[in-house]
Amino acid sequence: QRLPRMQEDSPLGGGSSGEDDPLGEEDLPSEEDSPREEDPPGEEDLPGEEDLPGEEDLPEVKPKSEEEGSLKLEDLPTVEAPGDPQEPQNNAHRDKEGDDQSHWRYGGDPPWPRVSPACAGRFQSPVDIRPQLAAFCPALRPLELLGFQLPPLPELRLRNNGHSVQLTLPPGLEMALGPGREYRALQLHLHWGAAGRPGSEHTVEGHRFPAEIHVVHLSTAFARVDEALGRPGGLAVLAAFLEEGPEENSAYEQLLSRLEEIAEEGSETQVPGLDISALLPSDFSRYFQYEGSLTTPPCAQGVIWTVFNQTVMLSAKQLHTLSDTLWGPGDSRLQLNFRATQPLNGRVIEASFPAGVDSSPRAAEPVQLNSCLAAGD
């Protein structure tokens, strides 16, 4: 694989949002031959899925640049190597009165489709993003966020819900995916791995990132989440990958510094309001989008996923704090709280930018394998 090359005039350089130094791409294998990340503990394979070599226990392959920029997801290398079997981290499951199949977990039984049949649906999340197969859609305009810069008061509830750390957001955070596609932010939560093991939910060319943030939104067409579940576009999630960088991320520190207070499952604390948009990448114009599902039971479909191309940088210490502080069910550490990537089953991921175009001198002509389905919208 080629060495990373620096792009000094990168429009995404600067700021604390991440790296944007493009990596060289090799010829990509076909989708059928693409390596798939190892299933995380806790979810049985859906019918037809194979156990393929994983990459969780391999050292991460990514450039270490002293200059700030943003990693271009579409140019990440594919890691192909046999992975050691991953030991479930959350394999203790306490027996309690009233315990039933709805008490799902990442560590094993019950199989998620038994908890909710929708988890065996055909259009599930997360997925592996293959930029070369993404459809460039010029109609996908920059995301619009309004009211995300919150004042310190009122304070917000930060809770360890046993599956993640969740920040409940107040009314008034408005987000638009485009004209007539308006949403209200409800909450945000994170997914992570364990020491030396990445834990993002989505992957790019099989590459799993250290962590991932999800900001969950409800369409303004609905008053309540239960009304929107399973309805196309009823829910929308903004997702961004978290990566290791040289500096502490001050926005994230406002949350990470409080995790010790909510180490126990079910515990919560109040944190001052903060700039929620500062937790996301700064470039709202470059992203991938597809229709999928909630990544936890009940796995309801119809969720619009928007995955930022730009990543967010946290220090190594911050990523360690995230993955090594909280406790989940059964007195087990809350780690590796990500679902296995799910088959696209014919879905085409759209991109707001020409992600599949190889900009290297090697390419005689741009390569774009899928056309935009939303042209003219």
């Epitope: 315990d99 977990r105 969740q166 239960d226 829910l235 079910g266 989940g328 069910p329």
Partner: nanobody, 117 residues
């Protein structure tokens, strides 16, 4: 449309017991099993106070003022949340609210608990 309905409140003497129930109706039934459930209370002239939480996996947390006296539990098959309150004190007098946290907060209308001799 009522989503969460509390019951079981009433007048009780100090040292007595009550069991509160919170039943999910309508669309809230669909998300009950996946929600973190909680009891909050509001005493006269005071703010909302978290009493107890139970996660979807059954993990529980209690405020220091009720720990050892109150027990939160849930029956997902019945879509019902419970709060067993023992050794009640005058300072437990409040309106008790049921809360479901599933991407957004769902609230009940509240049930009055009065502890008085």
């Amino acid at each position: 449309q009522v989503q969460l309905v509390e019951s079981g409140g009433g007048l009780v003497q100090p040292g007595g017991s009550l069991r509160l129930s919170c039943s999910a109706s309508g669309g809230a039934r669909n998300i009950f099993s996946f929600a973190a459930m909680a009891w909050y209370r509001q005493a006269p002239g005071k703010g909302l106070e978290l009493v107890a939480v139970i996660t979807s996996a059954g993990g529980t947390q209690y405020s220091s003022s009720v720990k050892g006296r109150f027990t939160i539990s849930r029956d997902n098959s019945k879509k019902t949340l419970y709060l067993q309150m023992n050794s009640l004190r005058a300072e437990d007098t409040a309106v008790y609210y049921c809360n479901a946290d599933y991407y957004q907060d769902y609230w009940g209308q509240g049930t009055q608990v009065t502890v008085s001799s």
